[in-house]
């Protein structure tokens, strides 16, 4: 309830997160023209990436372009990229949709198609669909510990969401354990009314809202957080127009003195932690 006699002050906050969990990934691996099932283990260092501000990212799916080398090769024949003669290819041209710089030559991509040759990381990335179901769909069972320190400078009051009495093995539950600051990712989605398995394919953005409504008067002191969750990206975006959340990164290595890279298009959930609230004192 609004106490008009109190002096209110907005919260100043800092957030630190720690994600835990292991995923086993089974995918098709092609070596020397032979495709077989490959098994790999993903730990925190493999699927989380440091982000700026009050955010963390968990990779739930990926598409790899392995063994790329800087050389010349045909551009991937995406829509509008095919050619029939060199006239269609402009030397030095960098098409924003392309993955390289055109050499001016129209060359065979495969048996039936020709595309402009580019100087690029080759072979250029194919336009592949994100795997369905998501490769790291078991990320649903990962947990995140959220440490949230807050401060009201005008009232000279500081506290945090983690209490000394808290059990390190607890898991947040809206009813049974609303003060536990360890959250199962699947539960976050369930609370927000979203399907983790579905969002994991293309990625998305999930908001974790921490609301502090603090009464700092000594006779009726109360200052504990309330957690709520909601999806922040537009899930209704037309499928053809950049759905979900993804980015690319590369792992570089040398093989026979040739610099190579594996390009990874990572799909996943960016969790934005939004802290707001006020502290009131007479």
């Amino acid at each position: 309830s609004d106490k008009l006699y109190q002096r209110k002050e907005p919260v100043i906050s800092s957030v630190h997160t720690k994600v835990k969990g292991i995923a086993e990934v089974t995918e098709n691996v092609t070596e020397g023209g032979v495709t077989k099932l490959g098994h790999s283990i993903f730990d925190t260092a493999d699927y989380t990436f440091p982000l700026q501000g009050n955010s963390f990212f968990v990779m739930t799916n990926y598409v790899k372009s392995e063994g790329q080398v800087q050389t010349l090769c045909p551009e991937y024949p995406r829509r509008g990229a095919q050619c029939s003669s060199d006239r269609r290819c402009k030397k030095g041209w960098m098409d924003p949709q392309s993955k390289g710089i055109q050499t001016g030559r129209c060359v065979p991509y495969d048996k039936t198609r020709k595309t402009c040759e580019v100087s690029a990381w080759c072979p250029t990335e194919e336009e592949k669909e994100a795997p369905r179901p998501a490769l790291l769909r078991s990320a649903e069972n990962f947990t995140v510990l959220i440490k949230n320190n807050i401060h009201f400078p005008g009232h000279n009051y500081t506290t945090r969401n983690i209490l000394p009495t808290m059990n390190g093995s607890c898991t947040f539950h809206k009813t049974w354990d609303p003060q536990c600051s360890i959250f199962r990712l699947g539960d976050i989605f369930q609370e927000a009314g979203e399907n983790f398995t579905e969002v994991a394919v293309q990625g998305g953005i999930m908001g974790i809202e921490i609301y502090w409504d603090c009464n700092l008067d000594s006779w009726s002191h109360h200052c504990r957080p309330r957690y709520s969750f909601r999806r922040l990206d537009d899930k209704n975006t037309d499928e053809s127009f950049v759905p979900g959340y993804n980015f690319r990164y590369a792992k570089y290595y040398k093989e026979n003195n040739v610099e190579k890279r594996t390009l990874i298009k990572a799909f996943g959930i960016r969790f934005d932690i939004l802290v707001f609230g006020t502290g009131g004192k007479f």
Epitope: G67, V69, T71, V107, P108, Y109
Partner: nanobody
């Protein structure tokens, strides 16, 4: 799938020359040669992009082997000179998407260099 047929292998004396040829069933961006000596892994020898641009050679054959292409005929040749006994191997023709990346290989042709 691209079909590749190699020819030109044989027995030659050290210091001699040999020319290998390969015909592909369809046009392809890059064509190249690999070799495999007994008890060793298959290794890259030489590769050529479309119209012979770019070309790439293994350090061990630079200055001795020359790769050339005929796009119109979908063929690639490997002119080998100054042959050494360590060049003895089965030579495979290959096609791919760049001079570093190959998907299809032929059956191979034997080259033996005697000392």
């Amino acid at each position: 799938e691209v079909q590749l047929v190699e020819s030109g292998g044989g027995l030659v004396q050290a210091g001699g020359s040999l020319r290998l040829s390969c015909a592909a069933s369809e046009r392809t961006y890059s064509m190249g040669w690999f070799r495999q000596a007994p008890g060793k892994e298959r290794e890259f020898v030489a590769g050529s992009g479309w119209d012979g641009i770019p070309t790439r050679y293994a350090d061990s054959v630079k200055g001795r082997f020359t790769i050339s292409r005929d796009n119109a005929k979908n063929t690639v040749s490997l002119q080998m000179s100054g042959l050494k006994p360590e060049d003895t191997a089965i030579y495979y023709c290959a096609t791919g998407t760049s001079v570093y990346h190959y998907q299809y290989w032929g059956q191979g042709t034997q080259v033996t260099v005697s000392s």
